[in-house]
Interface confidence: low
């Protein structure tokens, strides 16, 4: 009789990533008896949670359920029934709710409490719902690039070519923006470190990792364009705000008590005349840029460098894959070309940033006014953090990779948190012979 | 091109209400502040207030506040100053205005109202 | 609200150069932006734009009106005038909605 293949045993695993402003679940697979070799893992899915992040939830627990069904049920979908008792699920909070907890921890606990108890209702193999650190996240993110692009391994690997191929085995740094946080993450040039506090060992795959990471807490996206507004606000004579990282012809009305709800705009707080300000765009590349600069310390450093506000930062090294917010604003902004000069950049930035908000409603139809406005703002923050925050130079920039997916995955976090938790990435390189989970146990 | 064509002169006693209208032809009133501004005889310029017809805002200058009422109507893209209480010192030129750009060239002038408060 | 001072009155002769201040009690600047506008008013007219942000000549208007200062200190100056200068003159801030000065007369000798 003719041998007939048996059918490939397949595993799967689900990660949620609850950011501050929105919540997104992840299911991965990959083949059981190759689950420890470098690169078998990928994404099959990803589904966006409808609403805001789990932080905003703080006053109605009561929905979380309903909020997260319809990407629960959605997995129910994907993973074959068969497969849903021993799929782990894992759900990590970031800096949203890291904001949360520093407001309150009872509130944060109540949420995580009601978020566990609603994921323990579904069929999978529920290991928990935690507030990540921002080490955690900026090492699991310097962790999935590199797994993806296979930089652990000296063995082919089993999908083609990735584009960012430097057919080497130094690894990538990982640049992540969220909306509440960013993350700085690579392996420096000099293994001794002036600061412990951004220190990570790790051996994988047989070999030995020195690792630099920080996560600036309130520099993600959002919650710097809070602090933007909370900054300027001062210094506005009444409640008009003539903003320069905004459309011309933009305009916007702020709630002070909004403002001034997070924990990132308290060192600028102060008794307004006013409950509401309006925005007025100005649409001034130049001024944002200036402005956005007045956000990051840099007067004071007790490192041999620093990135800013006195956060030790050694000298760059290698490639960088940014990915999250940095990919998703550049890639709308269509600057995100391995061609495009950090020249280039700065001048595409210009040019968007001033055209009038009539002409870029119209021009972009399809696009939600939210997140439309804040585009011009994002470009400009993004290009700031990285030459000035972080000391990316013209000449570096090209060193900066744009990254969305690779290999069909999406490029953050929740990937390399799921190898860990899931003991898929041995201290040692695997025998030739791919061999079970349970030899690494 | 963008053209401001305002209401007729009126005369009116004292404590009456008198209501000015601004039609806009040429463009959307929702692409611009809307202001209106009062020029008494042989005297200057003053701002009265604005409205956002995108959102129905308004601001008022403190001196007008309890008096005047601005509203947009963006169906026939005309803007409208209701002045109440009308005092003699309220004779005077009302003129519309557009400003699109805060800040930026005021685009375009009305001719102006002239109002007569008398008894 | 931001008070506007403008000196009230000025008489050039043709071909001179006139010169008219505006001076604001607070600042009308905001990121290297200068919210300061100027315009002419002839009788029976509305206002005319001559100059918006401090400097810009508005379009249509000649060369010969230009506008400067920063801050709190602002000048418009006509090099030459010309007969039909005579007009109104009224500087205006727009950093904060709307405020006007109280207008200089120009008389052309």
């Known amino acids: 009789t003719q041998n007939k293949a048996l059918p490939e045993n397949i595993k799967y695993g689900i990660v949620l990533d609850a950011g501050s402003s929105h919540t997104s679940l992840y299911i991965y697979k990959w083949p059981a008896e190759k689950e420890n070799d470098t690169g078998v893992v990928h994404q099959v899915e990803e589904c966006r949670v409808k609403g805001p992040g789990i932080s905003k939830y703080v006053q109605k627990v009561n929905e979380i359920g309903i909020y997260l069904t319809d990407c629960m049920e959605r997995a129910r979908e994907v993973i074959p029934r068969s497969q849903h008792q021993e799929t782990p699920v894992y759900l990590g909070a970031t800096a949203g709710m890291r904001l949360l907890r520093m407001e309150s921890e009872e509130l944060a606990d109540r949420v995580l409490d009601v978020v566990e108890r609603s994921l323990s209702n579904y069929p999978f193999d529920f290991q928990g719902a935690r507030i990540i650190t921002g080490q955690e996240e900026g090492a699991y993110g310097w962790i999935t690039i590199n797994y993806l692009l296979g930089k652990f391994s000296q063995k082919t690997r089993w999908f083609s070519i990735v584009p960012y191929e430097t057919n080497n085995q130094e690894t990538f740094g990982a640049l992540d923006l969220g909306g509440a946080s960013t993350q700085i993450t690579f392996v420096p040039q000099n293994q001794t470190t002036e600061s412990p506090d951004n220190a990570l060992q790790f051996r994988l795959y047989g070999k030995d990792y020195n690792v630099y990471t920080h996560s600036f807490l309130c520099y993600g996206k959002d919650q710097a364009l809070w602090q933007k507004l909370a900054k300027d606000i001062q210094v506005a004579s009444n409640e008009i705000l003539r903003d320069p990282c905004f459309h011309p012809g933009y305009k916007k009305v702020v709630n002070v008590s909004d403002l001034y709800k997070t924990p990132c705009t308290k060192r600028f707080e102060m008794t307004l005349p006013f409950q509401q300000f309006e925005i007025q765009g100005i649409g001034n590349y130049q001024q944002c840029h200036q402005s956005v600069l007045e956000l990051f310390n840099t007067s004071y450093c007790p490192y041999s460098q620093c990135a800013f506000n006195g956060i030790f930062l050694p000298p760059l090294q290698g490639d960088f894959g940014a990915f999250s917010a940095f990919y998703f604003v550049m890639n709308f902004l269509n600057l995100t070309s391995e061609k495009v000069s950090q020249e280039k950049v700065t001048e595409m930035m210009k040019k968007f940033c001033s055209q009038p908000w009539e002409e870029i409603k119209t021009s972009y139809a399809g696009v939600k006014e939210k997140y439309l406005s804040e585009y011009c703002f994002s470009g400009t923050y993004i290009l700031s953090l990285l030459l000035q925050g972080y000391h990316f130079t013209a000449d570096s920039w090209e060193h900066i990779h744009f990254i969305g997916k690779i290999q069909g995955s999406d490029a953050g976090w929740t990937l390399g948190y799921m190898l860990n938790l899931t003991n898929m990435i041995p201290a040692e390189q695997p025998l030739s012979t791919p061999l079970s989970h349970s030899t690494y146990v | 091109e963008v053209q401001l064509v305002q209401s007729g002169a009126e005369v009116k006693k004292p404590g009456a209400t008198v209501k000015i209208s601004c039609k806009v032809s040429?463009?959307?009133?929702?692409?611009?502040?809307m202001h209106w501004v009062q020029q008494a005889p042989g005297k200057g310029l003053e701002w009265m207030g604005r409205?956002?017809?995108?959102?129905?805002?308004?601001k008022y200058a403190e001196k007008f506040k309890n008096r005047v009422t601005i509203t947009a109507d963006t169906s026939t893209n005309t803007v409208y100053m209701e002045l109440s209480s009308l005092r003699s010192e309220d004779t005077a030129v009302y003129y519309c205005?557009?400003?699109?750009?805060?800040?930026?060239?005021?685009?375009?002038w009305g001719q102006g109202v002239m109002v007569t408060v008398s008894s | 609200d931001i008070v506007l001072t403008q000196s009230p009155a000025l008489a050039v002769s043709p071909g001179q150069r006139a010169t008219i201040t505006c001076r604001t009690q607070q600042t009308v600047d905001h990121y290297g932006t200068t919210y300061m506008n100027w315009y002419q008013q002839k009788p029976g007219q509305p206002p005319k734009l001559l100059i918006y942000?401090?400097?810009s000549l508005a379009s249509g208007v000649p060369a010969r009106f230009s506008g400067s200062g920063s801050g709190t200190d602002f000048t418009l100056t006509i090099n030459p005038v010309e007969a039909d200068d005579t007009a109104n003159y009224y500087c205006q801030q727009s950093r904060n909605l709307w405020t006007f000065g109280g207008g200089t007369k120009v008389e052309i000798k």
């Open positions: 942000l401090a400097s």
């Open positions: 040429g463009d959307s009133i929702t692409a611009y502040f």
């Open positions: 409205i956002d017809p995108d959102h129905e805002r308004t």
């Open positions: 205005a557009t400003e699109r750009v805060p800040g930026f060239e005021t685009d375009y």
